[in-house]
C-alpha cells in the first residue's frame, strides 16, 4: 500500500500555496509594471540569455544535484522547481519594494528577474540540508523567510557598506549554507531504525545528480558574472570562473581517488567538488588579474571540498542530522568562507602596499559584511527551523523521511523504485 499524503496536509498545502499565489498576483497587479522603455532586440536577447543561464542552473543544475537519494529523487527535483518558481515571484516583489517602492510602482526589468533568480538560488542551496525531512507546506515557509532575509541583508549591506550588486549578492554562498545548516539543526535529527537505506544514494539518481553538477559547472561563469556592470569586468569574471572550475574538476577527481584507501572515486565528492572553484572565486572573480591565480584558487578549493566531503559528513550527520550525500551545506559554508577570505586578503595586500589606514578600514568593513551575513543567516535560519517545527505544517513523520511515496502518486506502487 502506498503512503498517502497526510489528510491534513492535503487540505493545508493547496490552501496555503494557492492563497499565497493569489496574494502575489494581487501584489503584482497593484504594485508592478513592466519597463516600457525602448530597447533594441539584440540587447534584450543578450540580457535574457544571462537570465536563462541562471534559470538552467537553478532548475536543472541544483534540481538534479539534490536528487541522488534512492527514494527521494522525484521530490528533490520537483520541490526545487516549486521553490524556484515561488522564490522568483517573491524576490522580484521584495527587491522592488526595498529598492524602488518609494518612487511609486515597482518596475520589472530583465535585470530584476536575473536578480530574483539568484535570490531564489539561495533557497535551493539551503534546502539541500533539509530535503527529505520536510513537506511542501514547510518549504513554502522556508522560501518566504529566506528570500526576505537575503533581500534585507543585501539592502543593508548596500546602504551601510556602500557595495554594488555583485559584491552583496556574492554573500549568497555563505548566507545560504549557514541558513540551511541552522534550519537543519532545528529539525528532528535521528533517523529511526529501518529507514537508513532511504538516505543512501542509488546509481540512476546519482547519475542525474552528476548531470545537475555538469549543468552547474557549465553555467557557473554566468552566475559569477551576471551582476557585473561592464564588459571588461564580466569578461574577466567569466575567464577566472572557468579556469577555477576547470582546475577544481581535476582536483576533485584526483583528490577523491587519493582520499580513498583503494584509490576509488567517490560520486559524492565529485558532485560537490567540481563546483568548488566557482564558489571560491565568486566574490573576487572580476578582480583576479591572471589565470594562474584563478587556477590556484580552484586547486585549493577542490582540495578543501574533497577534504570537507571526507571528514565533515560524520559530524554533520550527528549534530545536524544531514545525510552523507547532502554535501552542499558544509561544502558551500567552507568554500563561501574561502571566497570571502580571498577578497579580504586582496584588501589586506592593498593595505600592505599602500601603508594606508583607510584601506585597513575597508578590510574591517568587509569583515563586518561577512559577519553580518553569517549572523543574519544563522538567526533567520533558526527562526525558520522553529517555524517549521510547528504542528500546523504536519511535517512528515521521521519514518517517512526521504520517501517519494509520501508525496507522489506511483501507479506501480513499487517500493524499490
Amino acid at each position: 500500500m502506498s503512503s498517502k499524503y497526510p489528510r491534513s496536509v492535503r487540505r493545508c498545502l493547496p490552501l496555503w500555496a494557492l492563497t499565497l499565489e493569489a496574494a502575489l498576483i494581487l501584489l503584482f497587479y497593484f504594485f508592478t509594471h513592466y519597463d516600457a522603455s525602448l530597447e533594441d532586440q539584440k540587447g534584450l536577447v543578450a540580457s535574457y540569455q544571462v537570465g536563462q543561464d541562471l534559470t538552467v542552473m537553478a532548475a536543472i543544475g541544483l534540481g538534479f544535484l539534490t536528487s541522488s537519494f534512492r527514494r527521494h529523487s522525484w521530490s528533490s527535483v520537483a520541490f526545487n522547481l516549486f521553490m524556484l518558481a515561488l522564490g522568483v515571484q517573491w524576490a522580484i516583489l521584495l527587491d522592488g519594494f526595498l529598492s524602488q517602492f518609494p518612487s511609486g510602482k515597482v518596475v520589472i526589468t530583465l535585470f530584476s528577474i536575473r536578480l530574483a533568480t539568484m535570490s531564489a538560488l539561495s533557497v535551493l542551496i539551503s534546502v539541500d540540508a533539509v530535503l527529505g525531512k520536510v513537506n511542501l507546506a514547510q518549504l513554502v515557509v522556508m522560501v518566504l523567510v529566506e528570500v526576505t532575509a537575503l533581500g534585507n541583508l543585501r539592502m543593508v549591506i548596500s546602504n551601510i557598506f556602500n557595495t554594488d550588486y555583485h559584491m552583496n549578492m556574492m554573500h549568497i554562498y555563505v548566507f545560504a549554507a549557514y541558513f540551511g545548516l541552522s534550519v537543519a539543526w532545528c529539525l528532528p535529527k535521528p533517523l529511526p531504525e529501518g529507514t537508513e537505506d532511504k538516505d543512501q544514494t542509488a546509481t540512476i539518481p546519482s547519475l542525474s545528480a552528476m548531470l545537475g553538477a555538469l549543468f552547474l559547472w557549465m553555467f557557473w561563469p554566468s552566475f559569477n558574472s551576471a551582476l557585473l556592470r561592464s564588459p571588461i569586468e564580466r569578461k574577466n569574471a567569466v575567464f577566472n570562473t572557468y579556469y577555477a572550475v576547470a582546475v577544481s574538476v581535476v582536483t576533485a577527481i584526483s583528490g577523491s581517488s587519493l582520499a580513498h584507501p583503494q584509490g576509488k572515486i567517490s560520486k559524492t565528492y565529485v558532485h560537490s567538488a567540481v563546483l568548488a572553484g566557482g564558489v571560491a572565486v565568486g566574490t573576487s572573480c572580476h578582480l583576479i588579474p591572471s589565470p594562474w591565480l584563478a587556477m590556484v584558487l580552484g586547486l585549493v578549493a577542490g582540495l578543501i571540498s574533497v577534504g570537507g566531503a571526507k571528514y565533515l559528513p560524520g559530524c554533520c550527520n550527528r549534530v545536524l542530522g544531514i545525510p552523507h550525500s547532502s554535501i552542499m551545506g558544509y561544502n558551500f559554508s567552507l568554500l563561501g568562507l574561502l571566497g570571502e577570505i580571498i577578497y579580504i586578503v586582496l584588501l589586506v595586500l592593498d593595505t600592505v602596499g599602500a601603508g594606508n589606514g583607510m584601506i585597513g578600514f575597508q578590510v574591517l568593513l568587509s569583515i563586518g559584511e561577512l559577519s553580518l551575513a553569517i549572523v543574519i543567516a544563522l538567526m533567520s535560519g533558526l527562526l525558520t527551523g522553529l517555524l517549521l517545527n510547528l504542528k500546523i505544517w504536519k511535517a512528515p513523520h521521521e519514518a517517512k523521511y526521504f520517501d517519494d511515496q509520501v508525496f507522489w502518486k506511483f501507479p506501480h506502487l513499487a517500493v524499490g523504485f
Partner: antibody, heavy 129, light 108 residues
C-alpha cells in the same frame, strides 16, 4: 571623432512630459554605460541617471526616481531620457555623458574605474507656466 | 547617500601659484571611484583625474590628485590662465553617483 549630441530640450509647462535624445558617434556605443547629468542655472552638477552598456540595469537620483526613465537603443546609437511630471526644479541644462570603464592591475588584483570621460554640449530644459 | 563637500567654495589665486582643492566625503569612498572634473563657463565638464590620482588622457602633469577614504585633494602645481574654472569632485558607490558642490577658482 567621439561625439555626443543632445536634443529634445525646450520650454514645457509643469506636469507635462518631454523626451531628450542623445546621438552617439565615433565609438562603439554598445560597450559603454551612459549617463544623464544636469545643471540648474548658476548651480553645480547633479547626476540624474545611468544605464548599463546592455540596457539591463538603470539607476536614478532620488529627486527623479519614478518620474524619469533612461533607456537606450544600441542599434541606433541613441540614449533617451523620458521626463514625466516635470517640475520647476527640473529646469536645467541636461548633458549626456559616456561612461568609460577602465582598469589597472597589480600582480594580485585589478582596480576598475568608472568615469564620465566624454560629454555632450547639453540641451536646455525650462519648466515654466 | 554619500555627500561630497568641497572646500573652499571660492579660491582666488594668481597665475603661477599653487592651488589646493579639497573634497571630503560623508563616508569612506573607494579611491578607484573618485574623479575630478573641470568646467568652464558655457562649456560641458571635462574629466581631469580618475581613480583619485590618475590623470585622464591629454591632461597636463601640473594637475595631480591624491587622498583616500574620506579626504581627497586636487592640486594644480602652477596655475595657467586657462585653469581658472569651476572644479567638481565626483564619486561612485553602490551604483549611485554624487558630485561635490564645486570650487570656483578665480583670478586674484
Amino acid at each position: 571623432e567621439v561625439q555626443l549630441v543632445e536634443s529634445g530640450g525646450g520650454v514645457v509647462q509643469p506636469g507635462r512630459s518631454l523626451r531628450l535624445s542623445c546621438a552617439a558617434s565615433g565609438f562603439t556605443f554598445s560597450n559603454h554605460g551612459m549617463h544623464w547629468v544636469r545643471q540648474a542655472p548658476g548651480k553645480g552638477l547633479e547626476w540624474v541617471a545611468v544605464i548599463w552598456y546592455d540596457g539591463s540595469n538603470k539607476y536614478y537620483a532620488d529627486s527623479v526616481k519614478g518620474r524619469f526613465t533612461i533607456s537606450r537603443d544600441n542599434s541606433k546609437n541613441t540614449l533617451y531620457l523620458q521626463m514625466n511630471s516635470l517640475r520647476a526644479e527640473d529646469t536645467a541644462v541636461y548633458y549626456c555623458a559616456r561612461e568609460m570603464a577602465s582598469y589597472s592591475s597589480s600582480w594580485y588584483r585589478r582596480y576598475y574605474y568608472y568615469v564620465m570621460d566624454v560629454w555632450g554640449k547639453g540641451t536646455t530644459v525650462t519648466v515654466s507656466s | 547617500e554619500i555627500v561630497l563637500t568641497q572646500s573652499p567654495g571660492t579660491l582666488s589665486l594668481s597665475p603661477g601659484e599653487r592651488a589646493t582643492l579639497s573634497c571630503r566625503a560623508s563616508q569612506s569612498v573607494s579611491s578607484s571611484y573618485l574623479a575630478w572634473y573641470q568646467q568652464k563657463p558655457g562649456q560641458a565638464p571635462r574629466l581631469l583625474i580618475y581613480g583619485a590620482s590618475s590623470r585622464a588622457t591629454g591632461i597636463p602633469d601640473r594637475f595631480s590628485g591624491s587622498g583616500s577614504g574620506t579626504d581627497f585633494t586636487l592640486t594644480i602645481s602652477r596655475l595657467e590662465p586657462e585653469d581658472f574654472a569651476v572644479y567638481y569632485c565626483q564619486q561612485y558607490g553602490s551604483s549611485r553617483y554624487t558630485f561635490g558642490q564645486g570650487t570656483k577658482l578665480e583670478i586674484k
